[in-house]
């Protein structure tokens, strides 16, 4: 599990909200833009992390749990 700083009243995820102290996002958008939740068909897109949707590009990206890396958070981060 990651370094979420989410308070206990929420249904916790393994990585916090963008802007909180999380592992760097992979598949970076070309420009700063708006993210929303990934559509349901991407429910299992991120193997060890949370999926978020790059609205301008209509593509999914992943915020990896601590200790994982890769476009879909599919690899163990050996440097962690």
């Amino acid at each position: 599990s990651g370094n979420s700083t989410r308070s206990p009243e929420t249904n916790g995820l393994s990585c916090g909200y963008p802007g909180e102290n999380c592992t760097a996002t992979t598949v970076q958008p070309k420009r700063k833009g708006h993210f929303s939740r990934c559509p349901k068909q991407y429910k299992h897109y991120c193997i060890k992390g949370r999926c978020r949707f790059v609205v301008a590009e209509q593509t999914p990206s992943c915020i990896c749990d601590e200790g994982y890396t890769g476009a879909r958070c599919e690899r163990v981060d050996l440097f962690y």
Epitope: S7, E9, P18, G19, E20, S36, R37
Partner: antibody, heavy 119, light 107 residues
Framework: QVQLLESGGGLVQPGGSLRLSCAAS????????MSWVRQAPGKGLEWVSG???????TYTDSVKGRFTISRDNSKNTLYLQMNSLRAEDTAVYYC?????????????WGQGTLVTVSS | SYELTQPLSVSVALGQTARITCSGD??????VHWYQQKPGQAPVLVIY???DRPSGIPERFSGSNSGNTATLTISRAQAGDEADYYC?????????FGGGTKLTVLG
């Protein structure tokens, strides 16, 4: 304790303006997307506007160009500036916290503030 | 624009099972959330992501979503369950609510 408290509602004439505020407490306000949802008397819920933690804004068609959503993270406060008000804007306005980001669900709601547009 | 359709009212006998439906085109491909609202109060989230329950919500509340219909099921209905219930989904960067269903608990 996680809490949202709206204020600023009242009676305003058609064409007038009003600014609603929503004071947040008990959580890291700047980390969440926030929304305004309204409910006309005896009617259902209608989403009005949303604001992401990085400043992205989105509105329902009927308020575009008239309403502006904003936030002041230093004051833990969400705002809704309402201009060119119409009778059909009469409703209880709720401030709601989006779980994580846009596209999730509203896990915390305020108690609402009533806006009445009438001459 | 995307539309969610709910029955205006549903009645259930005390202790029995109530089912409230929410219909929308291919709604099964979207996440659906349910809110309970009692008179004069703010809405409360009772089901999120089709079938998950927030902490503090009784196990009697459950949800399902498939095809063109999402369903909120309330087992062993109690008098305190009498309220308006709204389904909600996300479409094209905007929030969509159903029209709401008034649940009446008889007896």
């Amino acid at each position: 304790q996680v809490q949202l408290l709206e204020s600023g509602g009242g009676l305003v004439q058609p064409g007038g303006s009003l600014r609603l505020s929503c004071a947040a407490s008990g959580f890291t306000f700047s980390s969440y997307a926030m929304s305004w949802v309204r409910q006309a008397p005896g009617k259902g819920l209608e989403w009005v506007s949303g604001l992401g933690h990085v400043g992205y804004t989105t509105y329902t068609d009927s308020v575009k160009g008239r309403f502006t959503i904003s936030r002041d993270n230093s004051k833990n406060t969400l705002y809704l500036q309402m201009n060119s008000l119409r009778a059909e804007d009469t409703a209880v306005y709720y401030c709601a916290r989006d779980y994580l980001d846009f596209g999730y669900y509203f896990d915390v709601w305020g108690q609402g503030t009533l806006v009445t547009v009438s001459s | 624009s995307y539309e969610l359709t709910q029955p205006l009212s549903v009645s259930v006998a005390l202790g029995q099972t109530a089912r409230i439906t929410c219909s929308g085109d291919k709604i099964g491909k979207k996440y659906v959330h349910w809110y309970q609202q009692k008179p004069g109060q703010a809405p409360v989230l009772v089901i999120y992501d089709d079938s998950d329950r927030p902490s503090g919500i009784p196990e009697r509340f459950s949800g399902s979503n498939s095809g063109n219909t999402a369903t909120l099921t309330i087992s062993r209905a109690q008098a305190g369950d009498e309220a308006d219930y709204y389904c909600q989904a996300w479409d094209m960067q905007s929030v969509v609510f159903g029209g709401g269903t008034k649940l009446t608990v008889l007896g």
